[in-house]
């Protein structure tokens, strides 16, 4: 089956959600780990990640269609210390499959705002930190 990983971001007030979404078949969930790394060009692994999610097979989902599993990493207030390059990755201990998402970046600017760039589908988010709105 076709397995892929995408990265996205959303804002709720001052909170920034970084989301790693893995699309896979139901039976492929077992043994899969999704993880998010920061500033790790070569050694992104569950052990060096900021957060990881171990997928479990959900017997409640019928059929063999494609399903998605999400890892959400929430930053309550983005600060200059969050500036850097992030990457969503996944791997299967069962099949040996390794997935690496596109690199995306958080840049905290001198004005106190931040931008998230490099997301799939040319998604470019610019946030005003103080106002907590999408600008």
């Amino acid at each position: 089956g076709c397995i892929n990983i995408t990265s996205s971001a959303s804002q709720e007030g001052t909170r920034l959600n970084l989301i790693c979404t893995v699309w896979h078949k139901k039976e492929e969930a077992e043994g899969f780990v999704v993880f998010l790394c920061k500033d790790r060009s070569g050694d992104c692994s569950p052990e060096t990640s900021l957060k990881q999610l171990r997928l479990k097979r959900d017997p409640g989902i019928d059929g063999v269609g494609e399903i998605s599993s999400q890892l959400m990493f929430t930053i309550s207030q983005v600060t200059p210390l969050h500036s850097g390059t992030y990457q969503c990755c996944a791997r299967s201990q069962k099949s040996g499959i390794r997935l690496q998402g596109h690199f995306f970046s958080i840049l905290f600017t001198e004005t106190g705002n931040y931008t998230v760039t490099g997301l799939k589908q040319r998604q470019h988010l610019e946030f005003s930190h103080n106002e907590g709105t999408l600008s």
Partner: antibody, heavy 119, light 107 residues
């Protein structure tokens, strides 16, 4: 278990230098931004400086800018605070602390090291 | 720079009493964190993001507030709660600021 152990404190004359170290264990040090927070005798807490996980970005409170330098060695799981041109008002217990990645709280603190600046 | 003003600066409470410590910010802030510090010890995170209790903190503690006014409340004061409590916030560009502390003693 997370452990932060500071060292390098002591008595120093005004205008002189001192370098503090903080040895970290029990977590993936290279993933976390780190900070120094100080507390003058019988006084409150005061943030001094922070450094990002990779060590490339540093931030300071205005009163120590140009005199203090925060740095880290991820291979040694250690962060440092180089303190130059010390003043009597720098006398304090200096705490090493970790930045919580998802929040702006300092979640782990060392036991602190005393720095006394006096002639 | 945002200034955090804690009140009272010190207080004494009886066991079982309800205690409220307030922290006022000179400008609106998004979240407030609270730390507990006992004599000779390091500060411990106690309440974070205004109302979330840190690991191991008894549920007699609670936090609330928004904008410029925040508070930490102890529902039934116990002897082990005697300590100094500090509020803390983050904003740009002054970064991290703390209140001057509230010393809480037991009768």
């Amino acid at each position: 278990e997370v452990q932060l152990v500071e060292s390098g404190g002591g008595l120093v004359q005004p205008g002189r230098s001192l370098k503090l170290s903080c040895a970290a264990s029990g977590f993936t040090f290279s993933n976390y931004a780190m900070a120094w927070v100080r507390q003058a005798p019988t006084k409150g807490l005061e943030w001094v400086a922070s450094i990002n996980s990779g060590g490339g970005n540093t931030y300071y409170r205005d009163s120590v800018k140009g005199r203090f330098t925060i740095s880290r060695d991820n291979a040694k799981n250690t962060q440092y605070l180089q303190m130059d041109s010390l003043r009597s008002e720098d006398t304090a217990t200096y705490y090493c602390a970790t930045h919580n990645y998802e929040s702006t709280v300092f979640d782990y603190w060392g036991q602190g090291v005393m720095v006394t600046v006096s002639s | 720079e945002i200034v955090l003003t804690q009140s009272p600066t010190s207080m004494t409470a009886s066991p079982g009493e309800r205690v409220t410590i307030t922290c006022r910010a000179s400008s609106s802030v998004s979240y407030m964190h609270w730390y507990q510090q006992k004599p000779g010890a390091s500060p411990k995170p106690w309440i974070y993001e205004t109302s979330k209790l840190a690991s191991g903190v008894p549920d007699r503690f609670s936090g609330s507030g928004s904008g410029t006014s925040y508070s930490l409340t102890i529902n039934n004061m116990e002897a082990e709660d005697a300590a100094t409590y500090y509020c803390q916030q983050w904003n740009y560009p002054s970064m991290y600021t703390f209140g001057a502390g509230t010393k809480l003693e037991i009768k």
